[in-house]
């Protein structure tokens, strides 16, 4: 059988190294050897691939080496497959070396900010030594912030043959570390060089970017003062490296700036004690280069009616995210504040908050929340300076079986009935939403019975029991992940009801 016709010929010119072609099929059933015929010097010359027989056999690749590699040039390539039965030739393929040239990567030797030019890095590199002198090179510069996995790219060309080349990358974030890598190719080529070694540079520092500001309103104290927990953080989009030296807070009752009070702190939270009126609060951060823009918050009067516009809310899990979505009756509201914290019996240790704009959903990566913990999630509508009524829900990112089952007791034991009561499992041991409870009970040496009830039921009356019989019983609490049995209890039904016994005695 003749060998298969060589097809899918693909060639690449590694500048000043070799011209290599590959083809299919890569393996033949019987021993096959290949000859690659080339014309070069624009068709003036012809030759064959100079691989020796031992490596050429059954090996679908061949390389032409200097000095017969000329550039610029057009080559033709034809592959002949030969076995004991004969020869099969490929079609003749045409290759413009400029279009398939692959060169070495450039070498970045510095990534630096330029004094006085904000949000810019100047990248300097050395053009690869193995690159045609006269050719225009195209470049792709890849860059990312040091803690990000996502690369951004910018493309440009350089015509000059100066070996020391530069590019100014603008519109970056201030005071941020960037990782850079560069690749290049002759302008007409379809093949890019590899990526250069990565190099890191930091943009110049600026005055702080800004703050996101929020509050937790606590119940008024006996003396009428209201504790307001202020909290702030670097605004979304602020440089990662940005450091504030401190924060200035000032606040006053609405329409009464004479009563302005000021506070300076290095913390990112501060408790104020305000009167019952409406207050305005302002916070700025500062560093050695200046102050951030002012963050403003209106604290409503104690008796102010807040608007309500969130009608419903759902929390759902994707493979790696928790997504909370809500529906609103107020289309003009396009800013929302999301709060989330663990639902624990004690005061929550971690309280988180985040602003959402122009969306009615909020997403958090599952790994930012603890599995088996219940989270309270509240969404506040924000319309200009007014904060509306929150809508709250609860969610687990991962449910497990409860750490303990319900503590159970048997009450009102009768001849054929018993009332079973159990306690709710403490929040810290639920590990998920309790879906239902199942009561398992069994007479001594008898068959086991079970009864499942909703999670809002904490008591159940069992009937149709056998008189004067010992029973064992336990209650299982179940989440979506499964159930956990509570303590096993034993009881014995009466031989005669108290009521019947008493009546007989009366006679």
């Amino acid at each position: 059988v003749l060998p298969a016709k060589p097809e899918n010929i693909s060639c690449i010119f590694y500048y000043e190294e070799n011209f290599t072609c590959t083809w299919s099929p890569e393996k033949e059933a019987s021993y096959t050897w290949y000859k690659v015929k080339r014309t070069y010097s624009y068709g003036y010359k012809s030759d064959i691939c100079s691989t020796d027989n031992s490596t050429r056999g059954n090996h679908a690749s061949c390389s032409f080496l200097p000095p017969t590699i000329t550039n610029p040039d057009n080559y033709t390539i034809q592959v002949e497959a030969q076995n004991a039965d004969g020869i099969m030739k490929s079609d003749i393929t045409y290759w413009n070396l400029d279009a398939i040239m692959k060169i070495e990567p450039p070498e970045i030797f510095s990534v630096k900010s330029v004094l006085g030019i904000k949000r810019m890095l100047q990248i300097k590199w050395i053009r690869p030594v193995l690159a045609p002198h006269s050719s225009t090179l195209k470049y792709t510069l890849r860059f990312r912030t040091i803690n990000s996995a996502y690369w951004m790219e910018v493309n440009f060309t350089k015509e000059d043959i100066d070996r020391d080349e530069t590019y100014n990358l603008t519109e970056l974030q201030a005071f941020t570390e960037y990782v850079m890598t560069l690749r290049c190719a002759p302008a007409e080529s379809m093949f890019w060089s590899g990526w250069s070694q990565e190099k890191v540079g930091t943009t110049e520092e600026e005055a702080p970017y800004g703050l996101d500001l929020w509050r937790v309103l606590k119940p008024a104290m006996v003396d009428g003062r209201r504790p307001v927990q202020l909290m702030w953080k670097k605004a979304t989009g602020a440089p990662v490296l940005e450091k504030a030296l401190g924060y200035n807070i000032w606040y006053f009752p609405e329409n009464n700036t004479n009563l302005t009070e000021t506070v300076n702190t290095t913390n990112q939270t501060h408790e104020l004690y305000l009167g019952g009126k409406t207050y305005w609060v302002y916070v700025v951060s500062y560093n050695s280069l200046g102050e951030s823009p002012v963050a403003t918050l209106r604290i409503p009067a104690l008796n102010e009616k807040t608007f309500q516009c969130i009608e419903a809310m759902q929390a759902c899990l994707t493979q790696d995210q928790l997504v909370v979505e809500w529906q609103s009756s107020a289309p003009e509201v396009d800013t929302w504040m999301v709060e989330w914290f663990p639902d624990v019996d004690s005061e929550p240790s971690s309280f988180s908050w985040e602003s959402v704009s122009q969306a009615r959903n909020w997403t958090i990566q599952k790994d930012e929340l603890k599995p088996l913990w219940c989270y309270n999630i509240s969404v506040y509508p924000v319309l200009r300076d007014r904060v509306g009524q929150p809508y709250s829900t609860q969610a687990y990112v991962q449910e497990g079986i409860p750490s303990a089952g319900p503590v159970t007791q048997a009450d009102s034991i009768g001849v054929k009935t018993v009332t079973i009561t159990w306690k709710e499992i403490p929040k810290s041991k639920r590990n998920g939403f309790i879906k239902n409870y199942t009561i398992f009970y069994q007479a001594e040496d008898g068959k086991e019975f079970s009864k499942t009830v909703n999670s809002n039921i904490l008591q159940y009356r069992l009937e149709s029991l056998t008189r004067r019989t010992s029973y064992s019983l336990q209650v299982m609490a179940s989440t979506n992940a499964g159930g956990t049995n509570g303590t096993k209890i034993n009881f014995k039904t009466l031989s005669i009801s108290h009521h019947h016994h008493h009546h007989h005695h009366h006679h």
Partner: antibody
Framework: EVQLVESGGGLVQPGRSMKLSCAAF????????MAWVRQAPTKGLEWVAS????????FYRDSVKGRFTISRDNVKSILSLQMDSLRSEDTATYYC???????????WGQGVMVTVSS | QFTLTQPKSVSGSLRSTITIPCERT????????VSWYQQHLGRPPINVIY?????PSEVSDRFSGSIDSSSNSASLTITNLQMDDEADYFC???????????FGGGTKLTVL
């Protein structure tokens, strides 16, 4: 239509010089290697010289090396052959030919007769 | 440096098939492409085969080329011979030693 038109032939005495020209039409001249091929009366074809696309590389048969010079003007699309120290054995019809993309001379001129005789 | 050897003449009757061989004296015939040219008396050559076995689009499919490594030869085959096929035929290849083309001595084809 591809056309190659030679000029400049004739009778010349041994030891003297002569210049042949070939005007190219109908193709992008500077994309192709070009050649001169000669044919002595009643004899076979004999390659004389070739030149690369940009003119930087030239190739000659041994018997004409140092005597003949091939050149090209890519702006005017003209191929030239300067023949010095001519000998009687250089007597032949000289053809201008284009080297095609696959190792063949795909277009030829009509030829010009050069006679070297005293 | 190699030479290409062709028979001085070949003849064939009208509508028959003839083959003109072209033997390479040293090196493998398959190492460099072979081309064939037809030349009528007083006319310039015409390329009829290139790259061993490829035919220019304007050339009749009665012309075909091949190479045979066992005899280290290239061959031009003409089927269904016509009177107009009567001409000189030259084979040609590239010789890297002289960095240029080499022509065979030529074969005169006579159609009987």
């Amino acid at each position: 239509e591809v056309q190659l038109v030679e000029s400049g032939g004739g009778l010349v005495q041994p030891g003297r010089s002569m210049k042949l020209s070939c005007a190219a039409f109908g193709f992008t001249f500077n994309n192709y290697y070009m050649a001169w091929v000669r044919q002595a009366p009643t004899k076979g074809l004999e390659w004389v010289a070739s030149i690369s696309t940009g003119g930087g590389n030239t190739f000659y048969r041994d018997s004409v090396k140092g005597r003949f010079t091939i050149s090209r003007d890519n702006v005017k699309s003209i191929l030239s052959l300067q023949m010095d120290s001519l000998r009687s054995e250089d007597t032949a019809t000289y053809y201008c030919a284009r080297h095609g993309t696959i190792a063949a001379m795909d277009y030829w001129g009509q030829g010009v007769m050069v006679t070297v005789s005293s | 440096q190699f030479t290409l050897t062709q028979p001085k003449s070949v003849s064939g009757s009208l509508r028959s098939t003839i083959t003109i061989p072209c033997e390479r004296t040293s090196g493998d015939i398959g190492d460099n492409y072979v081309s064939w040219y037809q030349q009528h008396l007083g006319r310039p050559p015409i390329n009829v085969i290139y790259a061993d076995d490829q035919r220019p689009s304007e050339v009749s499919d009665r012309f075909s080329g091949s190479i045979d490594s066992s005899s280290n030869s290239a061959s031009l085959t003409i089927t269904n011979l016509q009177m107009d096929d009567e001409a000189d035929y030259f084979c040609q290849s590239y010789d890297s030693n002289i960095d240029g083309p080499v022509f065979g001595g030529g074969t005169k084809l006579t159609v009987l």
